[in-house]
């Protein structure tokens, strides 16, 4: 069937439309286009004869139409009047006619809209605002956007006038937003520039900050006032009802008790004509004297002297407080407070008692702190430490030993080699050492204030060849699933690699095995009975390698759940009952038996000759491992038939 398709159906003014013919019959003589829904000679646009390929304009031809050999009609530079129906009249060779009608609609290209408002400065909770989208356009749809979102649902928002007008009733400050309108028709859509709604509001009740209402004499008073308001509020301050100044901040330096009173901030909005006030009561307290600490012993000796610290001045009806290391006083039998808490006594001072110490005097407002006091506790010297900890050195390297002993005042140091004094320094340096530098190295530390001396001796071996190492352990009898064991490969040697083997194999990968201390220490976490193996450590350097003798780990475990054998539970009267109990355990467990809950013998084997039905019952074997402190048991029922 002959049909007409309009492409497009909705046409913008000034554009073009193609009336496309479908299912055109065969063997045509010609065809004509007419404006309207029927064939009317007065409204013919154009005719076309196929044989001559001649197009003939009709009365309705505007010069903007082009007819194609396939009968399709193109209309250019479309005007509003072109809207409507178009009829194609087809004349077939057999002079039988056929008709088809199509249509399209013409719409204007919309201009960019704008928003007009009936109130540019509405007042919060009082005014309404009506926005209108201009211009008014036929066949256009109107849409509204707030902050680029579609309109929220609100009883205060109303659309009217075909959605062209948006009214906001009883505006609030939250309506301060970007508003846009949009016009749409089938051929175009345009959005306006945004209009910002400027809602006048406030002032709200002002806030005075800081919230603090108590001050000390001599401090500066700096109050700030803020009230939400549009336009911003104008501020005034009143003290005890008397006007002070028209500023947002009130500053009074070096206040006295006389500055106590009521402080009022007034906020005024000139556009809304509203005023709001807030009052705060300020109290100024007199400044007490700053406390300080006196001591009866400025250089106490550790473990010998006591020190009494006193908080000055003495003030009646005052609470005294103390702090050590910025913490309140710890509970300690060596710390004593006097009845009024004014004196703190440290009995038998230690080096850890240096402080700092602070005392405080409490008043109505706050606590006044003294300056911190540090005790100069004389102590030491402790046993000196010689570092590094290496005992083996390679020939040709430099030997640099450092000695340190905890001491106050700092210790004076001396070095001796094989008993011969070398130098009075903290560090001993010998370059390019040889085997002859092997020997006993002694560091002597001396405290001139206490007169005490302490020494440490270290054996240094100079050799490129490493000695046979040995393994030391921090736990010779670890308990299964409980203890950890740390093996350390001795000695500690410079420029040395440490290696480990278990049962002659290199270390297995296990989260329970950890190497540390430059691989010198092997730690087994949560030991199990399977860890009871031979452990060997090795040391190597550039010229030698050596292995220790094996150390076998003795893991204490068990007792596991015991097993009673034989498994039989039925016996004939007159038979011998011979039960044996076994439990995996290291060391071997202690065994005991109970029959029907009654203790029997402490043996691994329970023997009863010529049993009778009287021997029916429950037979329990109990095992205990004194080393692990663990116990276990099992119960077996025995039936004796007559």
């Amino acid at each position: 069937k002959l049909t007409i398709e309009s492409t497009p159906f909705n046409v913008a003014e000034g554009k073009e439309v193609l009336l496309l013919v479908h299912n055109l019959p065969q063997h045509l003589f010609g065809y004509s286009w007419y404006k309207g829904e029927r064939v009317d000679g007065n409204r013919q646009i154009i005719g076309y004869v196929i044989g001559t390929q001649q197009a003939t304009p009709g009365p309705a031809y505007s010069g903007r139409e082009i007819i194609y050999p396939n009968a399709s009609l193109l209309i250019q530079n479309i005007i509003q009047n072109d809207t409507g129906f178009y009829t194609l009249h087809v004349i077939k060779s057999d002079l039988v006619n056929e008709e088809a009608t199509g249509q399209f609609r013409v719409y204007p290209e919309l201009p960019k809209p704008s928003i007009s408002s009936n109130n540019s400065k509405p007042v919060e909770d009082k005014d309404a605002v009506a926005f209108t989208c201009e211009p008014e356009t036929q066949d256009a749809t109107y849409l509204w956007w707030v902050n680029n979102q579609s309109l929220p649902v609100s009883p205060r928002l109303q659309l009217s006038n075909g959605n062209r007008t948006l009214t906001l009733f009883n505006v609030t400050r939250n309506d301060t937003a970007s508003y846009k309108c949009e016009t749409q028709n089938p051929v175009s859509a345009r959005r306006s520039d945004s209009v910002i709604l400027n809602v006048l509001y406030g002032p709200d009740a002002p806030t005075i900050s800081p919230l603090n209402t108590s001050y000390r004499s001599g401090e500066n008073l700096n109050l700030s006032c803020h009230a939400a308001s549009n336009p911003p509020a104008q501020y005034s301050w009143f003290v005890n009802g008397t006007f002070q100044q028209s500023t947002q901040e009130l500053f009074i330096p070096n206040i006295t008790v006389n500055n106590s009173g009521s402080y009022t901030c007034q906020a005024h909005n000139s556009d809304t004509g509203l005023n709001r006030t807030t009052v705060t009561t300020i109290t100024v307290y007199a400044e007490p004297p700053k406390p300080f600490i006196t001591s009866n012993n400025s250089n106490p000796v550790e473990d010998e002297d006591a020190v009494a610290l006193t908080c000055e001045p003495e003030i009646q009806n005052t609470t005294y407080l103390w702090w050590v290391n910025n913490q309140s006083l710890p509970v300690s039998p060596r710390l004593q407070l006097s009845n009024d808490n004014r004196t703190l006594t440290l009995l038998s001072v230690t080096r850890n008692d240096v402080g700092p110490y602070e005392c405080g005097i409490q008043n109505e407002l706050s606590v006044d702190h003294s300056d911190p006091v540090i005790l100069n506790v004389l102590y030491g010297p402790d046993d000196p430490t010689i570092s590094p900890s290496y005992t083996y050195y390679r020939p040709g390297v430099n030997l640099s030993l450092s000695c340190h002993a905890a001491s106050n005042p700092p210790a004076q140091y001396s070095w001796l080699i094989d008993g011969n004094i070398q130098q009075h320094t903290q560090e001993l340096f010998i370059s390019n050492i040889t085997e002859k530098n092997s020997g006993l190295y002694t560091c002597q530390a001396n405290n001139s204030a206490s007169g005490h001396s302490r020494t440490t001796v270290k054996t240094i071996t100079v050799s490129a060849e490493l000695p046979k190492p040995s393994i030391s352990s921090n736990n010779s009898k670890p308990v299964e699933d409980k203890d950890a064991v740390a093996f350390t490969c001795e000695p500690e040697a410079q420029n040395t690699t440490y290696l480990w083997w278990v049962n002659g194999q290199s270390l297995p990968v296990s989260p329970r095995l950890q190497l540390s201390n430059g691989n010198r220490t092997l730690t087994l976490f949560n030991v199990t009975r399977n860890d009871a193996r031979a452990y060997v450590c090795g040391i190597q350097n550039s010229v030698s390698a050596n292995r220790s003798d094996p150390v076998t780990l003795d893991v204490l475990y068990g007792p596991d759940t015991p097993i009673i054998s034989p498994p039989d539970s039925s016996y004939l009267s007159g038979a011998n009952l011979n039960l044996s109990c076994h439990s995996a355990s290291n060391p071997s467990p202690q065994y005991s038996w109970r029959i029907n809950g009654i203790p029997q013998q402490h043996t691994q084997v329970l023997f009863i000759a010529k049993i009778t039905p009287n021997n029916n019952g429950t037979y329990a074997c109990f095992v205990s491992n004194l080393a692990t402190g663990r116990n276990n048991s099992i119960v077996k029922s025995i039936t004796v038939s007559a």
Epitope: R394, P395, E435, S463, A464, E465, K468, Q540, V543, A545
Partner: antibody, heavy 120, light 106 residues
């Protein structure tokens, strides 16, 4: 298994220099030290020194300071010995050797030796 | 440097005979090590750290000593033991070898 393959014999003019190579297989040279030892005709063994391929640290016998230079190329698992200012007294078989770190010995693996002949 | 003196320079032994080679150090050392070298081959470690038998070495070889005096002993000489034996110290740099002892089969 562990093997040390040394480069072939060298004939060098007096005053010249030569670079010998020692390629390891069966282990990573970074895990050990490489020592060099020489043996003159009908003579005993002389230790030249060692190199740690992991960091390039070296130790030379005083006699060979300035005469021998050790280098390594860990990507090819090869150690090198460069000898300079050669004289007839440097005519010898040069061995590379090392001890694997997992074993308890050192000097337990030796190359087959490279013969260096210095001619006037 | 630590000079190692080996004696004898040459020794001949019949199969089954006991052989002892000594090594004297000019300065005391912790351990002594022994190598065997046959003509045209690389040295081979036989004893390490004074008394430990290297891998694959027959039990007839043994080592002992301390300080400056060390020895290598073959309990029963066999034909395959004919070689030159060197001692070595690794205590101090430079590492040094003895001049060698040539062991011949009688």
């Amino acid at each position: 298994q562990v093997q040390l393959q040394q480069s072939g014999a060298e004939l060098v003019k007096s005053g010249g220099s030569v670079k010998l190579s020692c390629t390891a297989s069966g282990f990573n040279i970074k895990d050990s030290y490489m020592h060099w030892v020489r043996q003159g005709p009908e003579q005993g063994l002389e230790w030249i020194g060692w190199i740690d391929p992991e960091n390039g640290d070296t130790e030379y016998a005083p006699k060979f300071q300035g005469k021998a230079t050790f280098t390594t190329d860990t990507s090819s698992n090869t150690a090198y010995l460069q000898l300079s200012s050669l004289t007839s007294e440097d005519t010898a078989v040069y061995y590379c050797n090392e001890g694997t770190p997992d074993g308890p010995y050192y000097f337990d693996y030796w190359g087959q030796g490279t013969t260096v002949t210095v001619s006037s | 440097e630590n000079v190692l003196t080996q004696s004898p320079a040459i020794v001949s032994a019949s199969p089954g005979e006991k052989v002892t080679i000594t090594c004297s150090a000019s300065s005391s050392v912790s351990y002594m090590h022994w190598f065997q070298q046959k003509p045209g081959t690389s040295p081979k470690l036989v004893i390490y750290s004074t008394s430990n038998l290297a891998s694959g070495v027959p039990a007839r070889f043994s080592g002992s000593g301390s300080g400056t005096s060390y020895s290598l002993t073959i309990s029963r000489m066999e034909a395959e033991d004919a070689a030159t034996y060197y001692c070595q110290q690794r205590d101090s740099y430079p590492l040094t070898f003895g001049a060698g002892t040539k062991l011949e089969l009688k």
